[in-house]
Structure formats: structure tokens, C-alpha cells
Interface confidence: low
């Protein structure tokens, strides 16, 4: 199979000896060999002078346009040109591929198999971590994010490894050792998952990571409108300020004795200062 140069490599002014590269013929430069080399001396072995630059512009020669395929180098002869072909190619213009598996064209431990048709003399089956027609390109297998939960992916060549963050395990860090399914929250607390973290939502009167610590239920100031909070063995009690009622003192009492349903979330009415 003919070598595949870098995509966009100039077929006239560039060639390659390895797949994916682009080497420039004399007088051309740039990553794709599309930029002519500017010569400050403006000396040229042959050709008319340019009216705009005063430099000599090369005239057509037998090697112009690079008549040698597959990275062959062209040299002028008195009558025409001659191609010097890279290994594995022959013919007047190096157009015939002679590379076979015997030439060992597969890099990085690729397995060479004879091609099924004349256009492909060989096919390389690449090992994990390599790709390209000659297994010349290394694949970044870690870019596929095989490690989860923030695990660090290490490509060791023969295999991938995940280095897990604390609290995670498994070959791909897929197991959260703090997963709610395997976590007990004490004193009636419930486990809550979210944002990759797992915590206990504790019952009233308890706190801490596993709800094992006694907490002050009044610390959250659960009584609205200046109500006074009292901790009680069964929960908490709000003693409401005059003019307010409800378990958390969230409803104002109207002068006529009727209570109004809240027009805003309980404990906070429009215009009321947040206590």
C-alpha cells in the first residue's frame, strides 16, 4: 500500500518516508510544504528575471512538479529525470509498491498480514494503544476516560491502570466506598447522594457525619417571627411572639381572630424582615 503522508501535504513539493510525515523538496517549506523558500540573494541557476522582485524565477525543469511518487527523490539527467525510490518502492516514478510483510512494515509490535488485493500488499493489525496503516501512531487510551470518580488514568502500554481518589475502589474506580447503599446513618438519619458525595441527613436532635452526635435542634432557628425555640425529647417546640401562630410561628393572627394562610413560604411573609 502506498505510504499515506500527512493530510494536506503538497503532492508537488512534499513527500514522506514514514506515514503521517511531510518532508519538503528543496525550495519549499511550511508544515505542508506549500510555502516557497524566499532567497534573499535572489540567485537562481536558471530562468528569467521577475519584474516585481528583480529575482530570477526558475523555469520549468524535468523535476518540477515532483514526478516521483511515494517520497522518491528526483534528479535531472541530460535527457529527462531519474527517481531514486525509498525502500519498498520501484518503477520509473516509484509508483509500484514492493513492500511485503517480509520488509517488516508494521511498527510497535503490529501483526502483518498479506493484503487480499494487489493495491494493498500488506495490512497491519495493531496492538492495543497503536493505530495507523503501519501502527505508527500511539493512541491516547486515557482520553476515553476509563477511570471514573476523578481517578487518574495511567497507560502502562500493556494495560491501563486507574489510581483512585480516597473513598473509591475498583479497577476503574467505579465503586464509591461511601455509597449510600452500604452506609448506615444512625438515629433515624437518611443517606443523601449528590454531587459525587454521600452524606447523612440527620433526624432532629442529631448531627455529625453519621448522625451519632446529639445536636441542638434550635441552632437552625426554626421558629419564625421572633418565636422562642425549646428543645424537647420528641423534637422542638416554638413559643410564638404575640400576633403569630403555627408550629413554627409562621402564620400571623388577624385582629378579628381569623388566621391567614401564608402567601409566601411558611415563616417568611413579604415585607417581613428575615429573622
Amino acid at each position: 500500500a502506498p505510504l499515506v503522508c500527512r493530510a494536506g501535504c503538497s503532492p508537488e513539493h512534499g513527500f514522506c518516508e514514514q506515514p503521517g510525515e511531510c518532508r519538503c523538496l528543496e525550495g519549499w517549506t511550511g508544515p505542508l510544504c506549500t510555502v516557497p523558500v524566499s532567497t534573499s540573494s535572489c540567485l537562481s541557476p536558471r530562468g528569467p528575471s521577475s519584474a516585481t522582485t528583480g529575482c530570477l524565477v526558475p523555469g520549468p525543469g524535468p523535476c518540477d512538479g515532483n514526478p516521483c511518487a511515494n517520497g522518491g527523490s528526483c534528479s535531472e539527467t541530460p535527457r529527462s529525470f531519474e527517481c531514486t525510490c525509498p525502500r519498498g518502492f520501484y518503477g520509473l516514478r516509484c509508483e509500484v509498491s514492493g513492500v511485503t510483510c517480509a520488509d517488516g512494515p508494521c511498527f510497535n509490535g503490529g501483526l502483518c498480514v498479506g493484503g487480499a488485493d494487489p493495491d494493498s500488499a500488506y495490512i497491519c493489525h495493531c496492538p492495543p494503544g497503536f493505530q495507523g496503516s503501519n501502527c505508527e501512531k500511539r493512541v491516547d487510551r486515557c482520553s476515553l476516560q476509563p477511570c471514573r470518580n476523578g481517578g487518574l488514568c495511567l497507560d502502562l502500554g500493556h494495560a491501563l491502570r486507574c489510581r483512585c481518589r480516597a473513598g473509591f475502589a475498583g479497577p476503574r474506580c467505579e465503586h464509591d466506598l461511601d455509597d449510600c447503599a452500604g452506609r448506615a446513618c444512625a438515629n433515624g438519619g437518611t443517606c443523601v447522594e449528590g454531587g459525587g458525595a454521600h452524606r447523612c441527613s440527620c433526624a432532629l436532635g442529631f448531627g455529625g457525619r453519621d448522625c451519632r452526635e446529639r445536636a441542638d435542634p434550635c441552632a437552625a432557628r426554626p421558629c419564625a417571627h421572633g418565636g422562642r425555640c425549646y428543645a424537647h425529647f420528641s423534637g422542638l417546640v416554638c413559643a410564638c411572639a404575640p400576633g403569630y401562630m403555627g408550629a413554627r410561628c409562621e402564620f400571623p393572627v388577624h385582629p378579628d381572630g381569623a388566621s391567614a394562610l401564608p402567601a409566601a413560604p411558611p415563616g417568611l411573609r413579604p415585607g417581613d424582615p428575615q429573622r
Epitope: 476516560q145 476509563p146 491501563l160 476503574r172 465503586h175 466506598l177
Partner: antibody
Framework: QEQLVESGGGLVQPGGSLKLSCKVS????????VSWVRQAPGKGLEWIGY????????YYASWVNGRFTISSHNAQNTLYLQLNSLTAADTATYFC?????????????????WGPGTLVTVSS | DVVMTQTPASVEAAVGGTVTINCQAS??????LSWYQQKPGQPPKLLIY???TLASGVPSRFKGSGSGTQFTLTISDLECADAATYYC???????????????FGGGTEVVVK
């Protein structure tokens, strides 16, 4: 197209050996593993073992007891199940199955692509 | 290894009805539970993975729930095409022994009248 195709099944005598192949195409091993699962005629599914080719890990069901071996030839996208010391109880259809492991950071561990299966008959 | 106990072994329901299949794991398997549908002469087909996520192309009539050791597959608005055997499958990883294992339930045959 993502597919797995098993081959190598057939008739084998008790005490004999067989090597099953599974040709994989259409997906990369980096985020997938492959399990071998079998199903005896008229019975349920039974997990045999699993290989995570990218990580070089193999796991087996405890009942396998070293009689079966899973291997992979990553360059040829082929997996193998070597069956040794076969008995009539090993008569089953053997499935090669893709296991979705961790894709784009999310763990699944579901068997999402199944081969058609290859029948192994152990009989004298 | 984890043992998966699937109940009932067989269930019958009418078209348009609802079927519930239960699966119990002998150890905590977190949310690593999948459900499969198998019809005679065919390989199984993935329906649900990670307890409740529908596989591509599976209708929302299939619903998975549960966590830890208890899991349920519910099929509502039953159709004739739902007649099949259903299997649950777990994945368990032991961080202590760095060993992973899969296991299948015994299967539930769903008969649609």
C-alpha cells in the same frame, strides 16, 4: 456495527477440550470488557468469566475451578474461551457478550451486545 | 460469589396489565443491576442497566427500581411482544480481594394472555 461472533463449538467427548473464539468488531476495548455466558438447553443464564482487555484483568465464577480460561488477542480483536475436562453438564450454548464498563466516566456494568452463541455438546 | 434470587419463576397477566418481577442479591451490589429479556432461540437483550436506566430503544413501559440488595422490574401496559423470560444480572466488586463477579438470577417467564 458493533458485533461479536462466536465460533468453535461442536461435539466433544467427556474429558475432552475445546477452544471457542469470539471475533469482535465495531468497538474499542478501552471502555468495554467481554464476558462469556452459557445457557444449558431449557435452562437459565450462567456467567462463566470476564476479561477487561485494556486492564489485563480476568475474573471467573467460583464454580469454574480453573477448568476454563479466557484470553484475548487484542491485535486481532479476538477473544478465546478454553474449555478443559468437559462433562455432559457443560453442554450448552456459549455466548460471548460485550460488557459496558465505564463510558465517559459513568459505570454501567451491563451486558449490552450479545453474540448469537455457539453450541457445545459433550457426549460419548 | 453473589447469589441472585429472582421471583416469581413464572407469572401470567393480561394484555394491558402490569407485571412485577423481584430480584434479591445475597450481598450489597450498590446500583449495579441489569435486566434482560430473552425470547426462544435468541440471545438475551439488555433492557435496563444501573438499576433504572433504560437501554437504547427500550420503551418506558419497562421500569427498574431498588438499591443495595432488593430490586424490581415493572412492566406496565403489557403487550403480546413482552412474552419472554426475564433475567436480572448483578455486578459485585470486592475491594478487599480486588475481584469482580457477575451473576444472573434464575429467570422469570412472563406469559401474556
Amino acid at each position: 456495527q458493533e458485533q461479536l461472533v462466536e465460533s468453535g463449538g461442536g461435539l466433544v467427548q467427556p474429558g475432552g477440550s475445546l477452544k471457542l473464539s469470539c471475533k469482535v468488531s465495531g468497538f474499542d476495548f478501552s471502555n468495554y470488557g467481554v464476558s462469556w455466558v452459557r445457557q444449558a438447553p431449557g435452562k437459565g443464564l450462567e456467567w462463566i468469566g470476564y476479561i477487561d482487555p485494556a486492564f489485563g484483568r480476568t475474573y471467573y465464577a467460583s464454580w469454574v475451578n480453573g477448568r476454563f480460561t479466557i484470553s484475548s488477542h487484542n491485535a486481532q480483536n479476538t477473544l478465546y474461551l478454553q474449555l478443559n475436562s468437559l462433562t455432559a453438564a457443560d453442554t450448552a450454548t456459549y455466548f460471548c457478550v460485550r460488557v459496558a464498563l465505564v463510558v465517559a466516566g459513568v459505570a454501567y456494568y451491563g451486558m449490552d451486545v450479545w453474540g448469537p452463541g455457539t453450541l457445545v455438546t459433550v457426549s460419548s | 460469589d453473589v447469589v441472585m434470587t429472582q421471583t416469581p419463576a413464572s407469572v401470567e397477566a393480561a394484555v394491558g396489565g402490569t407485571v412485577t418481577i423481584n430480584c434479591q442479591a445475597s450481598q450489597n451490589i450498590y446500583s449495579y443491576l441489569s435486566w434482560y429479556q430473552q425470547k426462544p432461540g435468541q440471545p438475551p437483550k439488555l433492557l435496563i442497566y444501573r438499576t433504572s436506566t433504560l437501554a437504547s430503544g427500550v420503551p418506558s413501559r419497562f421500569k427498574g427500581s431498588g438499591s443495595g440488595t432488593q430490586f424490581t422490574l415493572t412492566i406496565s401496559d403489557l403487550e403480546c411482544a413482552d412474552a419472554a423470560t426475564y433475567y436480572c444480572q448483578s455486578y459485585y466488586y470486592s475491594s478487599g480481594s480486588s475481584y469482580g463477579a457477575f451473576a444472573f438470577g434464575g429467570g422469570t417467564e412472563v406469559v401474556v394472555k
